[in-house]
Amino acid sequence: VEIYTSRVLEAVNGTDARLKCTFSSFAPVGDALTVTWNFRPLDGGPEQFVFYYHIDPFQPMSGRFKDRVSWDGNPERYDASILLWKLQFDDNGTYTCQVKNPPDVDGVIGEIRLSVVHTVRFSEIHFL
């Protein structure tokens, strides 16, 4: 599996962000596809579960991401993206996207470095 992500993402505190992860695979996409999202905080604390998809989306039942994450992917379009709502400053860190599409289960895990900021930079306003 080959992963494509937005790599670096900057978003404003209190807003929602789409964590984009798409993939390619030598195998046809089917019901065996799984997507796992995890989070590594900036402070180096333990990795935390964010989201899991296998036929249906499975949201975390507890923890920081409970009721704050939803599936925004589409397997037919090779899209494994998620939406993270109501961003907080302690959401800063690295989000990892792992896609397995048996028999294609190897490959690099995609990473997105999320920076939650007070306000968007002028250069980004200019190009929106």
Partner: antibody, heavy 119, light 108 residues
Framework: EVQLKESGPGLVQPSQSLSITCTVS????????VHWVRQSPGKGLEWLGV???????DYNAAFISRLSISKDNSKSQVFFKMNSLQANDTAIYYC?????????????WGQGTSVTVSS | DIQMTQTTSSLSASLGDRVTISCRAS??????LNWYQQKPDGTVKLLIY???RLHSGVPSRFSGSGSRIDYSLTISNLEQEDFATYFC??????????FGGGTKLEIK
């Protein structure tokens, strides 16, 4: 060897519809999506729409009301139909395979079919 | 829609030269940027996908780079067959995917 070949009418009357068939070989339409792109005389490339491996479609919003893409997997053919053609729809129409899946690059293209809209 | 701008519409170079073709997006496209070559007969070929990944069969003298809104295609040691028109295309948001206006590379 991956190949795509468009076949179209060449000349279309204004207000009439355009039908183009893209016949593919060297890969299966159950595994890869197919895009349609056009190039007007002396102009750049314009993405029109895509049909994915499972049969769902996405269209350029500028054409959604008059564009339809379908396919027959068993015949390895993709069908493009655009209604209500006008002179500014004169262009070369290409079909292209969606390669690299979620990289969304068009990795192999047909040679294109020239369409002139004129009475 | 995301606008893709190739500010240089034509470029002259000599055999053996190294040339860089630029492309700018109207917003961050997260490296979802592809490069195509179109020959005068209309034939279109993919060169680079996802900013810097070389499509199979494409010579290594082609390379891509960039991030956020600014991207470039570099051709080192130009060969006769490289004189063509080059288009960038963003595939970050769908629909629609959009192309740059093209840069025609001509022999000096």
């Amino acid at each position: 060897e991956v190949q795509l070949k468009e076949s179209g009418p060449g000349l279309v009357q204004p207000s009439q519809s355009l039908s183009i068939t893209c016949t593919v070989s060297g890969f299966s339409l159950t595994r890869y999506g197919v895009h349609w792109v056009r190039q007007s005389p002396g102009k750049g490339l314009e993405w029109l729409g895509v049909i994915w491996s499972g049969g769902s479609t996405d269209y350029n919003a500028a054409f959604i009301s008059r564009l339809s893409i379908s396919k027959d997997n068993s015949k390895s053919q993709v069908f493009f139909k655009m209604n209500s053609l006008q002179a500014n729809d004169t262009a070369i129409y290409y079909c292209a395979r969606n390669g690299y899946d979620g990289g969304y690059a068009m990795d192999y293209w047909g040679q294109g079919t020239s369409v002139t809209v004129s009475s | 829609d995301i606008q893709m701008t190739q500010t240089t519409s034509s470029l002259s170079a000599s055999l053996g030269d190294r040339v860089t073709i630029s492309c700018r997006a109207s917003q961050d496209i997260s490296n979802y940027l592809n490069w195509y070559q179109q020959k005068p007969d209309g034939t279109v070929k993919l060169l680079i996908y996802y900013t810097s990944r070389l499509h199979s069969g494409v010579p290594s003298r082609f390379s891509g780079s960039g991030s956020r809104i600014d991207y470039s295609l570099t051709i080192s040691n130009l060969e006769q067959e490289d004189f063509a028109t080059y288009f960038c295309q963003q595939s970050d948001t769908l629909p629609p995917w959009t192309f740059g206006g093209g840069t025609k590379l001509e022999i000096k």
